[in-house]
C-alpha cells in the first residue's frame, strides 16, 4: 500500500486558500468504512477521517472551520486537505497518514507569504533645515528590505526598522524613513523587496508644492 504526493511543497499567499493532495490506490469502489485518513501538522490534528466521516473532536482549534477533506475526492482515491483563509501560522510540515488495508504516510511542506502590497506613505518637512522626511510602511512576510530611489533610479540610503505587528496574524511591520533635501515635485520611490522570493512592491512619493509641517501621525495614501 503506497500513497503518493504529487507535490511536496506548496507556497501560497496569506489569506488565500490551499489544496494539498495525497493519493492512494483504490480498486473499483472505495470502502469508506475501511478508510482512515489523518492530516497532521507538527502534532496538531488537522483532519481525522474515520469510519466514513470526519471526527472534529480532536481537531486543533487553529484549524476549526478552515480545514476540509472533500468526500468526493476521497472516492477517487485522493485525500485532499483544503485550508481556507491561510494564516502565517499554517506554514510548516504537514503529514498525511492513510490506512486502507495497510498504511503509509507522506510529508508535505506549506510555506506562506504575505506580499507588502499596501504601502502607507507620509511626507513631512523640518522647517528649520528644510529637510524632508519620507516614510513608507507596510505589513507582510517574510522580512523585506526597503530600497529608496530617486527619479533617476539612483539608490538612496534610508533607515529601516522592522517590528512584529501586534495583530493576531503576527505579520512583520516594516517601516523605512528617508531624510533628504528635496524640492517641490521631486519624485522618490520606496520598494519593498523580499530577498528570497525576489518579489517587490513599490510606492511613489512626490514632494508637494506647499511646505508640509512635521506631522508624524498624518498619513496619506
Amino acid at each position: 500500500f503506497t500513497i503518493t504526493a504529487p507535490k511536496d511543497l506548496y507556497v501560497v499567499e496569506y489569506g488565500s486558500n490551499v489544496t494539498m493532495e495525497c493519493r492512494f490506490p483504490v480498486e473499483q469502489k472505495l470502502d469508506l468504512l475501511a478508510l482512515v485518513v489523518y492530516w497532521e501538522k507538527e502534532d496538531k490534528e488537522v483532519i481525522q477521517f474515520v469510519e466514513g466521516e470526519e471526527d472534529l473532536k480532536p481537531q486543533h482549534s487553529s484549524f476549526r472551520g478552515r480545514a476540509f477533506l472533500p468526500k468526493d475526492q476521497l472516492l477517487k482515491g485522493n485525500a485532499v486537505l483544503q485550508i481556507t483563509d491561510v494564516k502565517l501560522q499554517d506554514a510548516g510540515v504537514y503529514c498525511c497518514m492513510i490506512s486502507y488495508g495497510g498504511a503509509d504516510y507522506k510529508r508535505i511542506t506549506l510555506k506562506v507569504n504575505a506580499p507588502y502590497r499596501k504601502i502607507n506613505q507620509r511626507i513631512s518637512m523640518d522647517p528649520a533645515t528644510s529637510e524632508h522626511e519620507l516614510m513608507c510602511q507596510a505589513e507582510g512576510y517574510p522580512e523585506a528590505e526597503v530600497i529608496w530611489t530617486n527619479s533617476d533610479h539612483q539608490s538612496l540610503s534610508g533607515e529601516t526598522t522592522v517590528t512584529t505587528s501586534q495583530t493576531e496574524e503576527k505579520l512583520l511591520n516594516v517601516t523605512s524613513v528617508l531624510r533628504v533635501n528635496a524640492t517641490a515635485n521631486d519624485v522618490f520611490h520606496c520598494t519593498f523587496w523580499r530577498v528570497h522570493s525576489g518579489e517587490n512592491h513599490t510606492a511613489e512619493l512626490i514632494i508637494p508644492e506647499l511646505p508640509v509641517p512635521r506631522l508624524p501621525h498624518n498619513r496619506t495614501h
Partner: antibody, heavy 120, light 107 residues
C-alpha cells in the same frame, strides 16, 4: 493510566475452544482498534486479527480466518478473542494490544498476556 | 505475506557500546515499520513507529531508520536495561507481520 487486563491462564484439550477477554481502562475504548497477537514459547510474535470496537468491523489473518472470532463489548470496554478447534501448536501466550492511532497498526499498549496450553 | 527477516538473531554487546539490528522486508513496505522491545515474561513495548519516530517516553539512544525494504534499529550506547529481544513489524499490508526477533545479550 491506560491498562489492558486479560483473563487468566487456560488449559484446553485438542479440538476445544478458548475465549480470552481483555478489559481496558484509562482511555475511550471505541477510539482505538484492538489487536490480538500470539507468541508460542520461545518463538516470535504472530498477528491474529483486529477489531474496531466502535463499528465491530474485524480483519483476520487468513491463517486463522476460520478458527478465530474477535468481538467487543462497548458497555464493559472489553474485547474478546475466541479460538476454536484447538491443536497443540496453539499453545502460546496470547496478547491483546491497542493501536497507537486508530487504524495505523503499531501497538502502543499491551495486555499482560494469557497463557493457553493445549494438551490431551 | 510480507516476510520480515531480522539479523543477527543474537547480538552480544558490551555495556556502553552501540548496537544495530537489521530488518529486511520481502517487498517494499514504505516506512510502515515499528520496533518493539520485549523482556522475558513481559509484553512487548513499542519503541519506534513509521520507521523512525520514537514513541513517547522512549530514550533518545534508540533510533530507527530506513524505508522500502531495509530498516535498522540503533541503540547508541547500550544500558543494562536494554538487554532484551527486539522485533520489527510491518504494517504496510495485511497480514501484519513481525521479524523473528533479535536477542541483545551481554558480551
Amino acid at each position: 493510566e491506560v491498562q489492558l487486563v486479560q483473563s487468566g491462564a487456560e488449559v484446553k484439550k485438542p479440538g476445544a475452544t478458548v475465549k480470552i477477554s481483555c478489559k481496558v481502562s484509562g482511555y475511550t475504548f471505541t477510539s482505538y482498534w484492538m489487536y490480538w497477537v500470539r507468541q508460542a514459547t520461545g518463538q516470535g510474535l504472530e498477528w491474529m486479527g483486529r477489531i474496531d470496537p466502535n463499528s465491530g468491523s474485524t480483519k483476520y489473518n487468513e491463517k486463522f480466518k476460520n478458527r478465530v472470532t474477535i468481538t467487543a463489548d462497548k458497555s464493559t470496554s472489553t474485547a474478546y478473542m475466541e479460538l476454536s478447534s484447538l491443536r497443540s501448536e496453539d499453545t502460546a501466550v496470547y496478547y491483546c494490544a491497542r493501536d497507537y492511532r486508530k487504524g495505523l497498526y503499531a501497538m502502543d499498549y499491551w495486555g499482560q498476556g494469557t497463557t493457553v496450553t493445549v494438551s490431551s | 505475506d510480507v516476510v520480515m527477516t531480522q539479523s543477527p538473531l543474537s547480538l552480544p554487546v558490551t555495556l556502553g557500546q552501540p548496537a544495530s539490528i537489521s530488518c529486511k522486508a520481502s517487498q517494499d513496505v514504505g516506512t510502515a515499520v515499528a520496533w518493539y522491545q520485549q523482556k522475558p515474561g513481559q509484553a512487548p513495548r513499542l519503541l519506534i513507529y513509521w520507521a523512525s519516530t520514537r514513541h513517547t517516553g522512549v530514550p533518545s539512544r534508540f533510533s530507527g531508520s530506513g524505508s522500502g525494504t531495509e530498516f535498522t534499529l540503533t541503540i547508541s550506547s547500550l544500558q543494562p536495561d536494554d538487554f532484551a529481544t527486539y522485533y520489527c513489524q510491518q504494517y504496510n499490508s495485511y497480514p501484519l507481520t513481525f521479524g523473528q526477533g533479535t536477542k541483545v545479550e551481554i558480551k
